[in-house]
């Protein structure tokens, strides 16, 4: 999906008002210095591409985050503010949801969510030069 036509400011508002709090809740009990940020993004569409991938695509050691509250809210925000997102993405993530077993918070998942926090912070500061 091409995130170029999203309403970035409205997605930012949804992140600041609710998604960010759910990410913090998920990471509660974890030190902010525990994980190094290894995933980066260069602009807002790129950030959303990376956020979409890390949130909804299963990775080794972290089968799925899609059922977490922050993920459901991310999906809702993208569905509302990114025209065409629902048609291209929702069915795929729903198929994954059916295959998924019980929720398990592994260290790998915590690391992945830490990366997500970094991506979201970068999304919110699009004018900053890439480090």
């Amino acid at each position: 999906y091409d995130f170029t036509n999203c309403d970035f400011e409205k997605i930012k508002a949804a992140y600041l008002s609710t998604i960010s709090k759910d990410l913090i809740t998920y990471m509660s009990g974890t030190k902010s210095t525990e994980f190094n940020n290894t995933v980066s993004c260069s602009n807002r569409p790129h950030c959303l591409t990376e956020i979409q991938s890390l949130t909804f695509n299963p990775t080794a050691g972290c089968a799925s985050l899609a059922k977490e509250m922050f993920a459901m809210k991310t999906k809702a925000a993208l569905a509302i503010w990114c025209p065409g997102y629902s048609e291209t993405q929702i069915n795929a993530t729903q198929a994954m949801k059916k295959r998924r077993k019980r929720k398990v918070t592994t260290n790998k998942c915590l690391e992945q969510v830490s990366q997500l926090q970094g991506l979201w912070r970068r999304f919110n500061r699009p004018l900053l030069k890439q480090q």
Epitope: K10, A14, T18, A76, I80
Partner: antibody, heavy 120, light 111 residues
Framework: QVQLVQSGAEVKKPGSSVKVSCKAS????????INWVRQAPGQGLEWLGV????????IYAEKFQGRVTITADTSTSTAYMELSSLRSEDTAVYYC?????????????WGQGTLVTVSS | QSALTQPPSASGSPGQSVTISCTGT?????????VSWYQQHPGKAPKLMIY???KRSSGVPDRFSGSKSGNTASLTVSGLQAEDEADYYC???????????FGGGTKLTVL
């Protein structure tokens, strides 16, 4: 069962406000959109706005911007639509309608409608 | 004045086919595959018939079909039956600000 139940008919004076409720049951309230649509006597359907409780997002039709407020109470699975500065042209049946999960612009479940009459 | 334009009326005899059009712009119908159609009988709430241009809602007979060409969407009812007599409304998604637009409605009469 899966349904939306709306509050009863209202008679209001011009210039006043009305608040209509819509109680959801049988589905996960927060994940869906709750839209509000009205129909004046003998007229067509008109969309007022939508709320997606999961993310607290509301979007209003330009025509009603500043005059309509849509809210939701997730603890009671109830959505509300308040319309202010009422005039006679606001006399209509007001429907709440569920927007499909993540496809909030398709209304797959409707309330029974609430008749709001604005008359002096 | 509705944002989407529908003919006020359409008619057909039992067994015949009838097509109802819904015309918009490139900012709504032409820009997205997010057209839906609703059936409304007198005194009743509307019912979703077609969504995503051509997908039938559950329980809707396959006599109802939807299509789109450019800025115009169409609802076709084939093998008309008496119970198909109702008002039909089209809607289209119209971007993140406008969100949803309704057509003015078409009264379908089964002769």
């Amino acid at each position: 069962q899966v349904q939306l139940v709306q509050s009863g008919a209202e008679v209001k004076k011009p210039g006043s406000s009305v608040k209509v409720s819509c109680k959801a049951s049988g589905f996960t309230f927060g994940s869906y959109g709750i839209n509000w649509v009205r129909q004046a006597p003998g007229q067509g359907l008109e969309w007022l706005g939508v709320i997606v409780p999961l993310v607290g997002v509301t979007i209003y039709a330009e025509k009603f911007q500043g005059r309509v407020t849509i809210t939701a109470d997730t603890s009671t699975s109830t959505a509300y639509m308040e319309l202010s500065s009422l005039r006679s042209e606001d006399t209509a049946v007001y429907y709440c309608a569920r927007g499909q999960e993540y496809f909030y612009w398709y209304f797959d479940l409707w309330g029974q409608g609430t008749l709001v009459t604005v008359s002096s | 004045q509705s944002a989407l334009t529908q003919p006020p009326s359409a008619s057909g005899s039992p067994g015949q086919s009838v097509t109802i059009s819904c015309t918009g712009t490139s900012s709504d119908i032409g820009g997205y595959n997010r057209v839906s159609w609703y059936q409304q009988h007198p005194g009743k709430a509307p019912k979703l018939m077609i969504y995503e241009v051509n997908k039938r809602s559950s329980g809707v007979p396959d006599r109802f079909s939807g299509s789109k060409s450019g800025n115009t969407a169409s609802l076709t009812v084939s093998g008309l039956q008496a119970e198909d007599e109702a008002d039909y409304y089209c809607t289209s998604y119209a971007g993140t600000d406008t969100f949803v637009l309704f057509g003015g409605g078409t009264k379908l009469t089964v002769l």
